[in-house]
Every structure is written in structure tokens, then in C-alpha cells.
């Protein structure tokens, strides 16, 4: 494009004779202040004529000449008021001021929209003497412009207290249109309507928007920015994008792509962490979560006994840490594991089911219908037991173990004795007579000891005193009689 | 409300011109698009093409390119639908329609017969 | 150009009796609008993008579809719902009509 200037800006010398951009020998300038590398610009709006009415600050100096005839009142001189001009360009503006020889060390300072512009500008100085004037010119130039630069540009120059401020030079950068709001990348549900917001800027004005789904222009007609697209509902990802036209040209959003809410994927890699008698804690990858995040999973563990009645137990948990301790299985038993994780729009399929076992753990009950009894001429007290029930041996029993507590005037003592698992029936020497003795038996796994069972107690008498009566603890539902030897 | 009234029926012999009008109201005429679209006697809709209100500029679908020419008069939110050089064959009844985002036509005008007949 | 088909040419109901009129595209198709047109009339809009009712329109009507398979559905037919019924595609241009089917009174 071209820089454009929409006010006409011709070069009018600003005094008799030769202007200074002419560069005659005679007129060269006497001093060039830069303020920044020097730069020659792609165009310049030099001053126009001098004596128009003026609106800037104008400063009327007190001092008279020789003659005592007052100073015509000081003033800059009037420039091109808007400059127009596209991204990109040079651009050359400039203020200038007459002020008498009597002043010294007058600077001139540029200013943008109400800020004094500092640092590396490029922004040049320079003077012209005359006999009795010196012609100030002050030049501002940008090599690139950018929006930034938008703006009001002033001159400012001190005298006597006094500050002279130039009429507004405007600035207006044009370029593509900018995009201000772009469409997002969004997850919607399947034929269900959402929006799309699109807004771009200039200068140039107006922008219009055309929408663009999947490569096909949605709107036949321009729209004015801002844009809100509704999207009547999607049933498989789409991209959109939208494109920003003005008296310069067309951008092009970046283009999004709108996902379709679906079930996830199930889950892969179901992983057994660890094991124990009655637990299994297993791990997951969770499969894509169908662009909905993952709200919980269920893990879903059916014995895998083929004479088992095919019961499925259903443990929920939250969808992380994608790891689960199934509490509440039996020991020593085979396990099909499978997991399923859901989102808002459902569940997903069930990951492969994979196969896991629980160890052998300690027997949850004790022995039952134990019976003690006092052997008094062998000196013995004779233990009989029932085993456990096979299901609640929670493995395979490796024995017994008894634990015996004497107890006589204020002395305690126990004992613990191993039993192999074939019998079911102990004998322990008698350690103290004119004692009690109390009896608990536990059965033995490789998975460990279970509970003991209720204490049994007898009497051991001092030597003389017999008596036959056993103690013990009856197996419940057992009519059987108790022998007494 | 919107609206879309067409000009009435016109008898026309072939080789003659014929100018069928589509006058809108009820909206801002320059911010859709207007559709043509021709319906010959028992036969179904055929979409002829459409004219960027914005812009002015038409769009011809392929056997409507030549002698048919869409235009507008946007001071009176007026669409036109010109054929020239009529057939026996252009004898049908056209619609005008306006056209919303995803080329959605949410009103459509009365209908205008043609006949061509010597 | 993309063409569109409809079936069938002519549908057959009692009043009462669920129509479903198929539309099917020679290449994927983005949305699906969906008139309705009765003898001497204009077309009236009746189905927009795919799934969605035009103003007015009872819920008895019903659009699906996606990719090159289109349909429209009346779950039970009232004797003013006779009459032709024509999809018309966006995606591309031209902008194209199927050639209609029309629901009569068995």
C-alpha cells in the first residue's frame, strides 16, 4: 500500500529566500542536533505557509528592541494535522518555530498523547540564524510504524516560563485488520448448539467478519465485528476458523478445532501391584477420555471358579490415582478383574479382563470343641480340638499352635507349643502344681496364625488330688459327648 | 416481520426479456444474501444462484450463466432476476429467498410465473 | 457438484403412520436444511442444519443425519403434513436441492 497523506502537505519556505531542506552553502544549518541515528524517511511533510491563525499556546515576550517596537508573539507555525499512512511505512513529520536571537538555549520536546517521548527517537533538531531570528526546525521520524504509534504528536518549547505547544500532528497507522478475540478450541456435546466469538480491529474501519467451517464459508454475507457464530450443533470434529476483512486486506484467524464429546475408550494395561489374602491392589492406564474428563471408575471382580455362581462385585471409585484396593475377597481364590471408567456423556467399555489370585492368608477361626483335661498319672494335661472348617482355613493348615498359662499365688508363666497339622490332639506336661491352667489353640497357615480360641481353664492340684472332670469349649451344634479317660 | 413480495405472473413470447423484482422488508436489506431459485411445472426446486446484497455481486449456479442476470436497487431493498432472450423452457414459476448463515433460506417470496408462449 | 438423492419418490401413509424420508449425498455434506411445499404454495422452511425445528414448526418433525446419509421423520403424520418435502445441502457450492419426496394420503 501506499502511505497515503489525506490532507494535502506542500513545502512553503518559511522565510524569504531559500528554504533550508534546499541546502544552499549559505543557509546551511548552523547547529543539527540529533537525537537519535539519522534516518531518511520514505516521506516527509515538511511545514506549510507561516502567519495562518494559529491555535497552539502562544507566548508574547516582554523584552523590546532598540526601537522599543514589541516582538510579534511566538508561536509554532502550522504543520499537516493527520497523517495517514500504512503499517510498516516511514513516516516524517516535522514542527517549526521563528525565535528571536535575544533567546538562548531553546530546546523543543516532542510529545505523544500526552507523554514526553524520550530515549532513542528519532528525532532531530536543527537551527537556522538569522540577523535577527533563528528559524528552529524539529523533526520526528519512525522508519516502521506500527499501531503503537498511533497517536497525537505535539511539540513543546520553554521560554521565559513560558511553554509554546505546536498544534497536534495525528497520526493514524493502517494496517490488516487485527484480531482482538479469536475463536477457541472448545469440547462440545454431539447436536448441541455453542458459540463462537470472533472480533478484529483497524484502523481501517469498518472489519467483517466471514465465518469458515471446515474449509466451506459459513456466512454468504459479511459481518460486522465483533462476530458471534452460533453452531447449530456438530456430529463429528469440525475447524473453524474466521477470516477479518477491511479497506486493506484480509487476516485469517487461527483455526480451532471443536471436538465431539463421546464415551472414553476403557481403560488398557490393568496391572496387579500387590497382592494379599484378602485384598488386590491393581493399577490402570485410562483409555482416551473422549474429550470429557474421566468423573470415576468402576472396577468389577468375578470369582473365576467355574463353580462359582458368577456373582460380579461392583467397587466405584474417583477416576484417579487409577489405582484400587479390592478389599473383601477370599483368601486363596482366583479373581477375573476388569475396569471401567466414565465421563459426562458415560461409560466406557470394560477393559480386558485379567486374571489374579489372593495368597493364603491366617485361618479366620479358631479350633473348635477344644477339651482339656488332667492326666494325673503321667502327670500330663491332655488338649483335643476340632479343625477349623476348611473354608474359613483361608489356607493349607500347617498346624497348631498352643499357648498354656500357669498361674499359682502370684506367679504367671506362658507357654507356647507347635503342633503339626495331622493331629488333633496335644499333650503338655504339667509345669506347676496347686495352679490353673488356661489352654487357647490357634491353627496355623503359611499365611500366618489365626485367632485363638476361648481359654479354656483347669485346676491342677497339688500331687494326691485327682480329679477327672475335663474343661472345655464346646463346638457349637455338637451333641457329641465328651470322653473323660 | 420480514417479508419478500414478488411482482406478479408475466406472458411472455421467446426471445423476449423478462424482469422479475423481490422486495424486501422487515430487515436490513444489506446484511443477507438473496437466492433465486426456478421451479418448472411438476418438477422441483433448482437453485439458480444468489446476489451478495453487501457487495452487489452474483453468484451463478451452472446453466444459469448468460442470460440471466440478478441485480439490485438497494435504495428500495429490492432485488431483481433478469432473463433475456426467453425459452419455452425458462416457463416456470421463480422464487426469491433470503439467505442466512450455512446458506439456510428463512423466507422466501410468493413465487412469480413465467410463461413463455407464442 | 454435489447431488442429492431422495427416497423414496413417493411415500404412502395413513394418517397416523411414522414417515421417514431419506436424503442421501454423493459427498459429505456439512448440514442439511430441510422445506416443505405444498401445491401452489412456497416452499416453507421446515428443518435447519440437520436437527434443528424452524420456527413454528411441530415437534413432530424430526431431522438427523450426518456425513452423506440425511433423514427426516414424522412420528405420526396429520393430514396437513401431506405434501413435498426437499433437503437442501451446505457445504459446498452450488447450493443444491434433492429432487423431493412426496407424502400422500394412502
Known amino acids: 500500500a501506499i502511505t497515503e497523506a489525506r490532507e494535502e502537505a506542500k513545502p512553503y519556505p518559511l522565510f524569504p529566500g531559500p528554504f533550508p531542506g534546499s541546502l544552499q552553502t549559505d543557509h546551511t544549518p548552523l547547529l543539527s542536533l540529533p537525537h537519535a541515528s539519522g534516518y531518511q524517511p520514505a516521506l516527509m511533510f515538511s511545514p506549510t505557509q507561516p502567519g495562518r491563525p494559529h491555535t497552539g499556546n502562544v507566548a508574547i515576550p516582554q523584552v523590546t528592541s532598540v526601537e522599543s517596537k514589541p516582538l510579534p508573539p511566538l508561536a509554532f507555525k502550522h504543520t499537516v494535522g493527520h497523517i495517514i499512512l500504512s503499517e510498516h511505512k516511514g513516516v516524517k513529520f516535522n514542527c517549526s518555530i521563528s525565535v528571536p536571537n535575544i533567546y538562548q538555549d531553546t530546546t523543543i520536546s516532542w510529545w505523544k498523547d500526552g507523554k514526553e517521548l524520550l530515549g532513542a527517537h528519532h528525532a532531530i533538531t536543527q537551527f537556522y540564524p538569522d540577523d535577527e531570528v533563528t528559524a528552529i526546525i524539529a523533526s520526528f521520524s519512525i522508519t516502521s510504524v506500527q499501531r503503537s504509534d498511533n497517536g497525537s504528536y505535539i511539540c513543546k518549547m520553554k521560554i521565559n516560563n513560558e511553554e509554546i505547544v505546536s498544534d497536534p500532528i495525528y497520526i493514524e497507522v493502517q494496517g490488516l485488520p487485527h484480531f482482538t478475540k479469536q475463536p477457541e478450541s472448545m469440547n462440545v456435546t454431539r447436536n448441541t448448539a455453542f458459540n463462537l466469538t470472533c472480533q478484529a480491529v483497524g484502523p481501517p474501519e469498518p472489519v467483517n467478519i466471514f465465518w469458515v467451517q471446515n474449509s466451506s464459508r459459513v456466512n454468504e454475507q459479511p459481518e460486522k465485528s465483533p462476530s458471534v457464530l452460533t453452531v447449530p450443533g456438530l456430529t463429528e470434529m469440525a475447524v473453524f476458523s474466521c477470516e477479518a476483512h477491511n479497506d486493506k486486506g484480509l487476516t485469517v484467524s487461527k483455526g480451532v478445532q471443536i471436538n465431539i464429546k463421546a464415551i472414553p475408550s476403557p481403560p488398557t494395561e490393568v496391572s496387579i501391584r500387590n497382592s494379599t489374602a484378602h485384598s488386590i491392589l491393581i493399577s490402570w492406564v485410562p483409555g482416551f477420555d473422549g474429550y470429557s474428563p474421566f468423573r470415576n471408575c468402576s472396577i468389577q471382580v468375578k470369582e473365576a471358579d467355574p463353580l462359582s455362581n458368577g456373582s460380579v462385585m461392583i467397587f466405584n471409585t474417583s477416576a484417579l490415582p487409577h489405582l484400587y484396593q479390592i478389599k473383601q475377597l477370599q483368601a486363596l481364590a482366583n479373581y477375573s478383574i476388569g475396569v471401567s471408567c466414565m465421563n459426562e456423556i458415560g461409560w466406557s467399555a470394560v477393559s480386558p479382563w485379567i486374571l489374579a489370585s489372593t495368597t493364603e492368608g491366617a485361618p479366620s477361626v479358631a479350633p473348635l470343641n477344644v477339651t482339656v483335661f488332667l492326666n494325673e498319672s503321667s502327670d500330663n494335661v491332655d488338649i483335643r480340638w476340632m479343625k477349623p472348617p476348611t473354608k474359613q482355613q483361608d489356607g493349607e493348615l500347617v498346624g497348631y499352635r498352643i499357648s498354656h498359662v500357669w498361674q499359682s499365688a502370684g506367679i504367671s508363666k506362658e507357654l507356647l507349643e507347635e503342633v503339626g497339622q495331622n493331629g488333633s490332639r496335644a499333650r503338655i506336661s504339667v509345669q506347676v502344681h496347686n495352679a490353673t491352667c488356661t489352654v487357647r489353640i490357634a491353627a496355623v497357615t503359611r499365611g500366618g496364625v489365626g485367632p485363638f480360641s476361648d481359654p479354656v481353664k483347669i485346676f491342677i492340684p497339688a500331687h494326691g488330688w485327682v480329679d477327672y472332670a475335663p474343661s472345655s469349649t464346646p463346638a457349637p451344634g455338637n451333641a457329641d459327648p465328651v470322653l473323660i479317660i | 416481520q420480514v417479508q419478500l413480495v414478488q411482482s406478479g405472473s408475466e406472458l411472455k413470447k421467446p426471445g423476449a426479456s423478462v424482469k422479475v423484482s423481490c422486495k424486501a422488508s422487515?430487515?436490513?436489506?444489506?446484511?443477507?444474501?438473496v437466492h433465486w431459485v426456478r421451479q418448472a411445472p411438476g418438477q422441483g426446486l433448482e437453485w439458480m444462484g444468489w446476489?451478495?446484497?453487501?457487495?452487489?455481486?452474483?453468484t451463478y449456479a451452472q446453466g444459469f450463466t448468460g442470460r440471466f442476470v440478478f441485480s439490485l436497487d438497494t435504495s428500495v431493498s429490492t432485488a431483481y432476476l433478469q432473463i433475456s432472450s426467453l425459452k419455452a423452457e425458462d416457463t416456470a414459476v421463480y422464487y426469491c429467498?433470503?439467505?442466512?448463515?450455512?446458506?439456510?433460506?428463512?423466507?422466501w417470496g410468493q413465487g412469480t410465473l413465467v410463461t413463455v408462449s407464442s | 457438484e454435489i447431488v442429492l438423492t431422495q427416497s423414496p419418490a413417493t411415500l404412502s401413509l395413513s394418517p397416523g403412520e411414522r414417515a421417514t424420508l431419506s436424503c442421501r449425498a454423493s459427498?459429505?455434506?456439512?448440514?442439511m436444511h430441510w422445506y416443505q411445499q405444498k401445491p401452489g404454495q412456497a416452499p416453507r422452511p421446515l428443518i435447519y442444519a440437520t436437527s434443528n425445528l424452524a420456527s413454528g414448526i411441530p415437534a413432530r418433525f424430526s431431522g438427523s443425519g450426518s456425513g452423506t446419509s440425511y433423514t427426516l421423520t414424522i412420528s405420526s403424520p396429520e393430514p396437513e403434513d401431506f405434501a413435498v418435502y426437499y433437503c437442501q445441502q451446505w457445504s459446498s457450492n452450488p447450493r443444491t436441492f434433492g429432487g423431493g419426496t412426496k407424502v400422500e394420503i394412502k
Open positions: 459427498s459429505s455434506v456439512g448440514y
Open positions: 422487515g430487515y436490513t436489506f444489506t446484511n443477507y444474501g
Open positions: 446476489i451478495n446484497t453487501y457487495t452487489g455481486e452474483p
Open positions: 429467498a433470503r439467505g442466512v448463515r450455512y446458506a439456510y433460506m428463512d423466507y
